[in-house]
């Protein structure tokens, strides 16, 4: 009598997650009487996948009708494959008994599952950084198989090179994760810039997945401050302007101080955006020179995005000699970021 053979023709089968996998197995003889069982893995820890004899295996069906005696095909189909189904499957013939006696195993078929990576998620720094600083962005994607994957970073279409990428785990696994960090040097022009993390994988058929982050979430562009005085009006009032320019984000509070005392506080809102994404804001303060005997120190104090306040100060000189005054006297810069403005007390 010819020796029983259990034939698993495919050494490996690769299936896309969600599809069905067919694992082929034929036997050369139905003698002796006894069941065929399918296992994943070998040895004492093997997992029973299908038992023609009994049990409930909702995702597994016999390819051929096992109730036909002349049927020597014991192939199975596993539906709705997930990465967790990956492994080596063995078709095993038993002789009927108590317990059933294992007679012969097939050589095994390795099932690998092609699983798409999840959509890349890009996260930026927890706190904003100013221009000329370098910030880190991370990109993560999970659940893909096989392990081979390509990840690229772009800033405004240009590939970034300061990148560190890891695929985990290092050894064999049912699915893998990728984590990449890109270091990006910020410039004042980056409010409208975008970084893109692009993931390419065999399951994506050449159509990579992309995750994006806007640098607007990571950057802070501190304002420039300029204080100017308009011409003295006939009513002895001086119009002082504080120009706050090229800042981002919009969150900004401006406080006018007269001789150290708060005169007025304003919050920026609904400002028009510059082409580069930054904002400008101008605030005016009208100072009645005739109401002051002594010099007036005016300070424009700007608190931007929760950062320490930036000051620009003026000294308005109250003069008893109107002839000495200029109607629009040039500013005199001092070490304390002050400007001296001479006004007549008239």
């Amino acid at each position: 009598e010819e020796e029983l053979q259990v034939i698993q023709p495919e050494k490996s089968v690769s299936v896309a997650a969600g599809d069905s996998a067919t694992l082929n197995c034929t036997v050369s003889s139905l003698i002796p009487v006894g069941p065929i069982q399918w296992f994943r893995g070998a040895g004492p820890g093997r997992e029973l996948i299908y038992n023609l004899k009994e049990g409930h295996f909702p995702r597994v069906t016999a390819v051929s009708d096992p109730t036909k005696r002349n049927n020597m095909d014991f192939s199975i189909r596993i539906s709705n494959i997930t990465p967790a189904d990956a492994g080596t499957y063995y078709c095993v013939k038993f002789r009927k008994g108590s317990p059933d006696v294992e007679l012969k195993s097939g050589a095994g078929t390795e099932l690998s599952v092609r699983a798409k990576p999840s959509a890349p998620v890009v996260s930026g720094p927890a706190v904003r950084a100013t221009a000329e600083h370098t910030v880190s962005f991370t990109c993560e994607s999970h659940g893909f198989s096989p392990r081979d994957i390509t990840l690229k970073w772009f800033k405004n279409g240009n590939e970034l090179s300061d990148v560190q990428t890891n695929v985990d785990p290092a050894g064999k696994s049912v699915s893998y994760s990728i984590r990449s960090t890109a270091r990006v040097l910020l410039t004042r022009r980056d409010v409208h810039s975008q970084v893109i993390c692009e993931v390419a994988h065999v399951t994506l058929q050449g159509d990579p997945l992309r995750g994006t982050a806007n640098l607007s979430e990571a950057i802070r562009v501190p304002p420039f401050l300029e204080v100017t005085q308009q011409s003295m009006r006939a009513d002895n009032q001086v119009n002082v302007t504080c120009q706050v320019t090229k800042f981002y984000p919009q969150r900004l509070q401006l406080t006018w101080l007269e001789n150290g005392n708060v005169s007025r506080t304003e919050m920026a809102s609904a400002l028009p955006e510059n082409k580069d994404g930054t904002y400008n804001w101008t605030s005016w303060l009208l100072v009645n020179v005739s109401a002051h005997r002594d010099d007036v120190k005016l300070t424009c104090q700007v608190e931007h995005d929760g950062q320490p306040a930036v000051n620009k100060s003026f000294s308005v000189k109250v003069s008893a000699h109107p002839k000495e005054q200029g109607s629009n006297t040039a500013a005199e810069n001092t070490g304390t970021n002050e400007r001296n403005i001479y006004g007549g007390s008239g």
């Epitope: 003698i31 009487v33 109730t67 036909k68 005696r69 002349n70 009927k96 108590s98």
Partner: antibody
Amino acid sequence: EVQLVESGGGLVQPGGSLRLSCAASGFTLSSYDMHWVRQAPGKGLEWVSAIGTAGDTYYTGSVKGRFTISRENAKNSLYLQMNSLRASDTAVYYCVRGGVWDDAFDIWGQGTMVTVSS
Amino acid sequence: DIQMTQSPSSLSASVGDRVTITCRASQDINNYLAWFQQKPGKAPKSLIYTASSLHSGVPSKFSGSGSGTDFTLTISSLQPEDFATYYCQQYVSYPYTFGQGTKLEIK
């Protein structure tokens, strides 16, 4: 339709012989283990004999050496040659098909009556 | 030989009842146990194999369980056509052996 039809039963004297036949239709008999089961009047079921797909044969102790099971593939038929019959062999004899991979009985014939009496 | 013992030998029940018949093997038979139904003057009908698998066409009111030496056949809601004699059988090794039968009668 899968069917088993027995024939050959009848009245026979103790020590006599009888050959039972079982004609199979709807399937290939040689692909299955086949069995004979009997039931004495008013009694329970008793397995008598079997023939495997490889031609291997099995018998219950009380019929060993007296009964012979065989099959004829060309006629898709199963036989039970009964010699040296005894009164205790009186029963309805059923031809039964063994299930696919574990030999669980699935198809039964209608039975044929064998009476051994003088 | 493996001895098969059924209990009870007879059982009276009413239509709609749930009944359980037990079968014990004299040694471990794995789950190679079958159940058959037989009505007077008729050939047995195969109900269950490998202790719990229903043969094609057998209604789901029949269920089997057990492994090793102790087995049960349960009929969930008796109908008039279910009153018959039921046999268990081991088929793990030759000679195959049957239980003595359980006669299910209408109360």
